[in-house]
């Protein structure tokens, strides 16, 4: 609340997060031309990345392009990419949607379709839909511990969201435990009015807002955080503006002296922790 | 503009970036003592890293030290590092400029020079100039889509830089399309009065400032971003303060049961997205 | 100092850090059942990660779980995890403390203990103490160069912490060289009243505060940074809230066509650079 006689100062904040949970993933795995169901376990080292500070990422879905090699190959026949003769292919051209540089030749992609040959990581990534339901949909049950240290340097005041009296096996609840700083990911989405299972397919960005409204006067001292949640990406976004949240990364390796990579298109939730507020003192 | 009767509130911001583009890199590759021209393709998974929020990095140049192994070897004969006898080499000494710990012996580096032997990743990194022109100089034509969600919690107001009416194939232009949030990297540099080709060699830091000056009164509502660009690293910086922008990272692997690494010194542009501004309401 | 007639504006900041130093690590290495002392060298590419902006991380300690494979195995017999019959093990159950999903069977862990079998990365991570003293305790002697560019857009004023007159071989000292922006990690801890050797074992978070109190009036212009240091993690934190600072990451590889990983639990210091202050002008 506004106390006009107080000197207000914005919060200086530092955040540390720790995600916990294991996901069992079942997917079709093709080896030697045979496709079978594969089961695998993902733990924190597999689905999250050592990221700094105010953001953390949880992978909820992925598409893999395995064994890519730098060579020539036909590009993926996405809409408008097919050709019938070399005239349609321009040597040196880089289509922003494509994954390589055209050689100028129109070559067979499969028995019915031809596309421009490219110099690229081959075979080029197939533009297939993200798996539905999401492969790591059980990430809904993961939890995140959020530690927040705040400072009002002008008032020489420091505190944190976790107090010595708190119980490390609590789970945040708006009504029953609003000061617990261990959050179930599914609950965060529910609080924000969003459907985790749905967002997990394409990924998204979720804001965890921590609001500190601190009265630092000794006679009416109050300084505790208030947590709220809102979705930050635009779920109604046009396809051309890349809806959801994903990024590509690669694992490089050598096989028979050939440099190869596995390309992973990782979809997931980026959680942004947005800390704001003021400290007021007479 | 300052409206003194308004209650002003600083912006709470979340940013999401997506880089697009492919680079063809031509460089000398030595295999089995034979040097030949090698061509390779770099896509987003090769030149950028899954980074959070308000920064993204585009690699524009690199120097590789391949096949390093932990062992003993002569250190690189940079200025002042040569020796003529063991007296010049101090067992256990770590020169901040060196890449290893001295054994106390002065050994031949090549047929004319001797340097102190070190325990290090060997052969130690050669202190050679970054390639000129930069290997990924064509990154000038890459584009970045910037999505920015902002919030004024006190005014309970949220908006974003991308509106439903926007066209996903636009490119930002100060005059013709100042609201488009897809930026060509070369244009960002041009706007900032900098030469991309030059900066790409050693790397640098470029600021993309997004200024929201929001009038949230219903009768004169205005809340759109203004983009501006400025270089953040000091181009006139003394050599001792490490000009440009680079970092080293390693790819580890095993060969014949020996742990090896390829060390990459990556030069590039770090783009910092600096969002600021206020929301004012009566 | 407060000049009430001035128009105050918060600082917009960009930070770039560069860590220097080499650590010699001595640890027990087991190969083919034989344990011997192993010596290795860690340089920046080994102990730090290419992180953005306002944070950097220095690994000071680690625990490795080598050669893990996705299969079935007994879980680690931590407190309360032992079993005597299958009744104690629940098929499909994921204990948040465990590293896998239970199969429902109680199996021998060693000759005296039985635990629930899990589907996991096997053998599961042993819950052993972080090595004491810390393996990279010599990181105390590493240095970090901090470059900080600041901007007051409303006043159209930009400056940075490194001036052309500065000496690149300086080291920060509160009294003798308070403007030098090269900091010895051990000195940062000493200034904050903390013991580096102790914190290095479990890890921690250290704040480097850069305070800009800028008077931009031409007749009494002053705009230089003031550095201060404080520990941000809670050293008295209850075990259940994960004291210190660590994260897990994995190195994946194939051996005889089997997908394997080495899991590294990295303990270290995350340094958060907190830039704040105002620029005032008549």
């Amino acid at each position: 609340s506004d106390k006009l006689y107080q000197r207000k100062e914005p919060v200086i904040s530092s955040v540390h997060t720790k995600v916990k949970g294991i996901a069992e993933v079942t997917e079709n795995v093709t080896e030697g031309g045979v496709t079978k169901l594969g089961h695998s376990i993902f733990d924190t080292a597999d689905y999250t990345f050592p990221l700094q500070g105010n953001s953390f990422f949880v992978m909820t879905n992925y598409v893999k392009s395995e064994g890519q090699v730098q060579t020539l190959c036909p590009e993926y026949p996405r809409r408008g990419a097919q050709c019938s003769s070399d005239r349609r292919c321009k040597k040196g051209w880089m289509d922003p949607q494509s994954k390589g540089i055209q050689t100028g030749r129109c070559v067979p992609y499969d028995k019915t379709r031809k596309t421009c040959e490219v110099s690229a990581w081959c075979p080029t990534e197939e533009e297939k839909e993200a798996p539905r339901p999401a492969l790591l949909r059980s990430a809904e049950n993961f939890t995140v511990l959020i530690k927040n240290n705040i400072h009002f340097p002008g008032h020489n005041y420091t505190t944190r969201n976790i107090l010595p009296t708190m119980n490390g096996s609590c789970t945040f609840h708006k009504t029953w435990d609003p000061q617990c700083s261990i959050f179930r990911l599914g609950d965060i989405f529910q609080e924000a009015g969003e459907n985790f299972t749905e967002v997990a397919v394409q990924g998204g960005i979720m804001g965890i807002e921590i609001y500190w409204d601190c009265n630092l006067d000794s006679w009416s001292h109050h300084c505790r955080p208030r947590y709220s949640f809102r979705r930050l990406d635009d779920k109604n976004m046009d396809e051309s503006f890349v809806p959801g949240y994903n990024f590509r990364y690669a694992k490089y390796y050598k096989e028979n002296n050939v440099e190869k990579r596995t390309l992973i298109k990782a979809f997931g939730i980026r959680f942004d922790i947005l800390v704001f507020g003021t400290g007021g003192k007479f | 503009s300052d409206k003194l009767y308004q209650r002003k509130e600083p912006v709470i911001s979340s940013v999401h970036t997506k880089v697009k583009g492919i680079a063809e890199v031509t460089e000398n590759v030595t295999e089995g003592g034979v040097t030949k021209l090698g061509h390779s393709i770099f896509d987003t998974a090769d030149y950028t890293f899954p980074l959070q929020g308000n920064s993204f990095f585009v690699m524009t140049n690199y120097v590789k030290s391949e096949g390093q192994v932990q062992t003993l070897c002569p250190e690189y004969p940079r200025r002042g590092a040569q020796c003529s006898s063991d007296r010049r080499c101090k067992k256990g000494w770590m020169d901040p400029q060196s890449k290893g710990i001295q054994t106390g012996r002065c050994v031949p580096y090549d047929k004319t020079r001797k340097t102190c032997e070190v325990s290090a990743w060997c052969p130690t990194e050669e202190e050679k100039e970054a390639p000129r022109p930069a290997l990924l100089r064509s990154a000038e034509n890459f584009t970045v889509l910037i999505k920015n969600n902002i919030h004024f919690p006190g005014h309970n107001y949220t908006t974003r830089n991308i509106l439903p009416t926007m066209n996903g194939s636009c490119t930002f232009h100060k005059t013709w399309d100042p609201q488009c949030s897809i930026f060509r990297l070369g244009d960002i540099f041009q706007e900032a009065g900098e030469n991309f080709t030059e900066v790409a060699v050693q790397g640098g830091i470029m600021g993309i400032e997004i200024y929201w000056d929001c009038n949230l009164d219903s009768w004169s509502h205005h809340c759109r971003p203004r983009y501006s660009f400025r270089r953040l690293d000091d181009k006139n910086m003394d050599e001792s303060f490490v000009p440009g922008y680079n970092f080293r990272y390693a790819k580890y692997y095993k060969e014949n049961n020996v742990e090896k690494r390829t060390l990459i010194k990556a030069f590039g542009i770090r783009f910092d997205i600096l969002v600021f501004g206020t929301g004012g309401k009566f | 100092s407060d000049k009430l007639y001035q128009r105050k504006e918060p600082v917009i900041s960009s930070v770039h850090t560069k860590v220097k130093g080499i650590a010699e690590v001595t640890e027990n290495v087991t190969e083919g059942g034989v344990t011997k002392l192993g010596h290795s060298i860690f340089d920046t590419a080994d102990y730090t990660f290419p992180l953005q902006g306002n944070s950097f991380f220095v690994m000071t300690n680690y625990v490795k779980s080598e050669g893990q494979v996705q299969t079935l195995c007994p879980e680690y017999p931590r407190r309360g995890a032992q079993c005597s019959s299958d009744r104690r093990c629940k098929k499909g159950w994921m204990d948040p403390q465990s590293k896998g999903i239970q199969t429902g069977r109680c199996v021998p862990y060693d000759k005296t203990r039985k635990t629930c079998e899990v589907s996991a990365w096997c053998p599961t991570e042993e819950e052993k103490e972080a090595p004491r003293p810390a393996l990279l305790r010599s990181a105390e002697n590493f240095t970090v160069l901090i470059k900080n560019n600041i901007h007051f857009p409303g006043h159209n004023y930009t400056t940075r912490n490194i001036l052309p007159t500065m000496n690149g071989s300086c080291t920060f000292h509160k009294t003798w060289d308070p403007q030098c922006s090269i900091f010895r990690l051990g000195d940062i801890f000493q200034e904050a009243g903390e013991n580096f050797t102790e914190v290095a074992v479990q890890g921690g978070i250290m704040g480097i505060e850069i305070y800009w109190d800028c008077n931009l009036d031409s007749w009494s212009h002053h705009c230089r940074p003031r550095y201060s240091f404080r520990r941000l993690d809670d050293k008295n934190m209850d075990e259940s809230f994960v004291p210190g600072y660590n994260f897990r990451y994995a190195k994946y590889y194939k051996e005889n066509n089997v997908e394997k990983r080495t899991l590294i639990k990295a303990f270290g210091i995350r340094f958060d650079i907190l830039v704040f202050g105002t620029g005032g002008k008549f």
């Epitope: 090699v69 060579t71 020539l72 190959c73 070559v107 067979p108 081959c122 075979p123 | - | -």
Partner: nanobody, 115 residues
């Protein structure tokens, strides 16, 4: 699924030559040859992209074997000369999406190099 039929295998003396041919039931971007010796894993021998660009050879056969293909007929052939006893194997024709990536294999044809 692509059907592949190999021909041309047989017994040949060390230093001799042999030409293997393969016909595919449909056009594909790349065609190549693999071989498998008794007790060993299948290994890559040679590959050709569309119109013979690019070509790729295993180090062990470089300079001795030549791959060529006829796009119009969906065929590929492997001219082998300077044959050695260690070239003895079943040779498989394969098709795929690049000279490094193969999805379909034929039944194989036996090549034996012996005096």
């Amino acid at each position: 699924e692509v059907q592949l039929v190999e021909s041309g295998g047989g017994l040949v003396q060390p230093g001799g030559s042999l030409r293997l041919s393969c016909a595919a039931s449909e056009r594909t971007y790349s065609m190549g040859w693999f071989r498998q010796a008794p007790g060993k894993e299948r290994e890559f021998v040679a590959g050709s992209g569309w119109d013979g660009i690019p070509t790729r050879y295993a180090d062990s056969v470089k300079g001795r074997f030549t791959i060529s293909r006829d796009n119009a007929k969906n065929t590929v052939s492997l001219q082998m000369s300077g044959l050695k006893p260690e070239d003895t194997a079943i040779y498989y024709c394969a098709t795929g999406t690049s000279v490094y990536h193969y999805q379909y294999w034929g039944q194989g044809t036996q090549v034996t190099v012996s005096s």
